[in-house]
Interface confidence: medium
């Protein structure tokens, strides 16, 4: 049969951050190519990354259509043949279905990782500092505009702020379910800040990595008496 020499894909892995979503798998192809299919639980299969020699497929355009849907994906291993007319169907020249491997179910809203946040600015007024976290743009669209992380997650998303005096290592924390913190600081002291995005309602992928550290006395800050 035409598929006897193909190797089924394995180690299928979803890599997704802020809804940018790529399906990866092994092995590197030898005498075969891959085609990926994706569907919702109730929908039809849609083919992507036709006859690719890559071992990854960007499925972002599909999953952002509804990030609260559950998606199924599978990778077909297709024999590499040069046919006389230069075209192949997914099911080979003899109509048999090539071997495929299913990926685990993927629910973008639950499974996408939170990207590393960025501190947009901080402003000191007397003994208070307002720290603002940048609202990261996602690839989820609404009316042809890209939505931010807050647009998509709303109250599900909180931020944790870690802050400490430049002169010491003792960290304090604050939390917000907006993108802003207002914290008390000691006058005349410089502070450093780092933030982390958190979705408390999740059981996995709850936290992002910490943002780069920003310290008072650097460009991002502003000081007013």
């Amino acid at each position: 049969s035409g598929t006897t020499n193909t190797v089924a894909a394995y180690n299928l892995t979803w890599k997704s951050t802020n809804f940018k979503t790529i399906l990866e798998w092994e092995p590197k192809p030898v005498n075969q190519v891959y085609t990926v299919q994706i569907s919702t639980k109730s929908g039809d299969w849609k083919s992507k990354c036709f006859y690719t020699t890559d071992t990854e497929c960007d499925l972002t355009d599909e999953i952002v259509k509804d990030v609260k849907q559950t998606y199924l994906a599978r990778v077909f291993s297709v024999p590499w043949r040069n046919s006389t007319h230069g075209k192949e169907t997914l099911f080979g020249t003899h109509g048999e279905e090539p071997p495929f491997t299913n990926a685990r179910k993927f629910l973008p809203y639950r499974d996408t990782k939170l990207g590393q946040p960025t501190i947009q600015s901080f402003e000191q007024v007397g003994t208070k500092v307002n720290v603002t976290v940048e609202d990261e743009r996602t690839l989820v669209r609404r009316n042809n505009t890209f939505l931010s992380l807050r647009d998509v997650f709303g109250k599900d998303l909180i931020y944790t702020l870690y802050y400490w005096k430049s002169s010491s290592s003792g960290k304090k924390t604050a939390k917000t379910n907006t993108n802003e913190f207002l914290i008390d600081v000691d006058k005349g002291e410089n502070y450093c800040f780092s933030v982390q995005a958190v979705i408390p309602s999740r059981t996995v992928n709850r936290k992002s990595t910490d943002s780069p550290v920003e310290c008072m006395g650097q460009e991002k800050g502003e000081f007013r008496e």
């Epitope: 609260k68 849907q69 559950t70 629910l107 809203y109 639950r110 947009q120 603002t132 976290v133 940048e134 609202d135 609404r142 939505l147 931010s148 807050r150 647009d151 998509v152 997650f153 709303g154 109250k155 599900d156 998303l157 379910n177 907006t178 993108n179 802003e180 408390p200 309602s201 999740r202 059981t203």
Partner: antibody, heavy 120, light 113 residues
Framework: EVQLVQSGAEVKKPGESLRISCKGS????????IEWVRQMPGKGLEWMGD????????TYSPSFQGHVTISADKSISTAYLQWSSLKASDTAMYYC?????????????WGQGTLVTVSS | DIVMTQTPLSLPVTPGEPASISCKSS????????????LTWYLQKPGQSPQLLIY???TRESGVPDRFSGSGSGTDFTLKISRVEAEDVGVYYC?????????FGQGTKLEIK
């Protein structure tokens, strides 16, 4: 079509326990918050708390924390609001609602309400 | 908690005339991250469950007639009905959808003169 169907009216005595339900259909139940809202006779709307059925994560209004319990069974697409010991002041219409698709975009779908009457 | 204050509490209107309801919040509902105001408007018609009209202060929910519009930013918001119809009677509520606990205004009762 998205629908939230609530259990029927209840008449209870003070001190009794009660659980009312809200069954969702026409959408994937797990990733949408279910909100509970109280409306006392002739009064306005009061937000009580919410639950994300996929994980059972809840948030309560401080005004209701400790007096009610919100839970959900995602396998049957149903959320619950329960009291262990009712008071006369719990007499009200209770609505469940589903959050909108986008973050913090309001309560897009509402149940028909469950009237709870607590009287000795 | 964020306190939501609506005015007026009662609004008699002649059909075909415009109507305006004000809602003020005790804290800003503007997210500096994405410049969205998390203010929501609902209408509860007599004997019915509330229905969503406007979210993000100015985004009309699908199916809501375009005679309804929302505006405002920060702490001051307005719901306008360009031409009131008989079916618009009921109680209008604004809601803080920005931060927990979510809070409603006390309601504005619109009635036909």
């Amino acid at each position: 079509e998205v629908q939230l169907v609530q259990s029927g009216a209840e008449v209870k005595k003070p001190g009794e326990s009660l659980r009312i339900s809200c069954k969702g259909s026409g959408y994937t139940f797990a990733p949408y918050w279910i909100e509970w809202v109280r409306q006392m006779p002739g009064k306005g709307l009061e937000w009580m708390g919410d639950i994300l059925p996929g994980t059972g994560f809840t948030t309560y209004s401080p005004s209701f924390q400790g007096h009610v319990t919100i839970s959900a069974d995602k396998s049957i697409s149903t959320a619950y609001l329960q009291w262990s010991s009712l008071k006369a002041s719990d007499t009200a219409m209770y609505y469940c609602a589903r959050s909108g698709y986008y973050g913090n975009s309001g309560f897009a779908y509402w149940g028909q309400g469950t009237l709870v009457t607590v009287s000795s | 908690d964020i306190v939501m204050t609506q005015t007026p509490l009662s609004l008699p209107v002649t059909p075909g005339e415009p109507a305006s309801i004000s809602c003020k919040s005790s804290q800003s509902l503007l997210s500096s991250g994405n410049q969205k105001n998390y203010l929501t408007w609902y209408l509860q018609k007599p004997g019915q469950s509330p229905q969503l009209l406007i979210y993000w202060a100015s985004t009309r929910e699908s199916g809501v007639p375009d005679r309804f519009s929302g505006s405002g930013s920060g702490t001051d918001f307005t719901l306008k009905i360009s031409r009131v119809e008989a079916e618009d009677v009921g109680v209008y509520y604004c809601q803080n959808d920005y931060t927990y606990p979510l809070t409603f205004g006390q309601g504005t009762k619109l009635e036909i003169k």
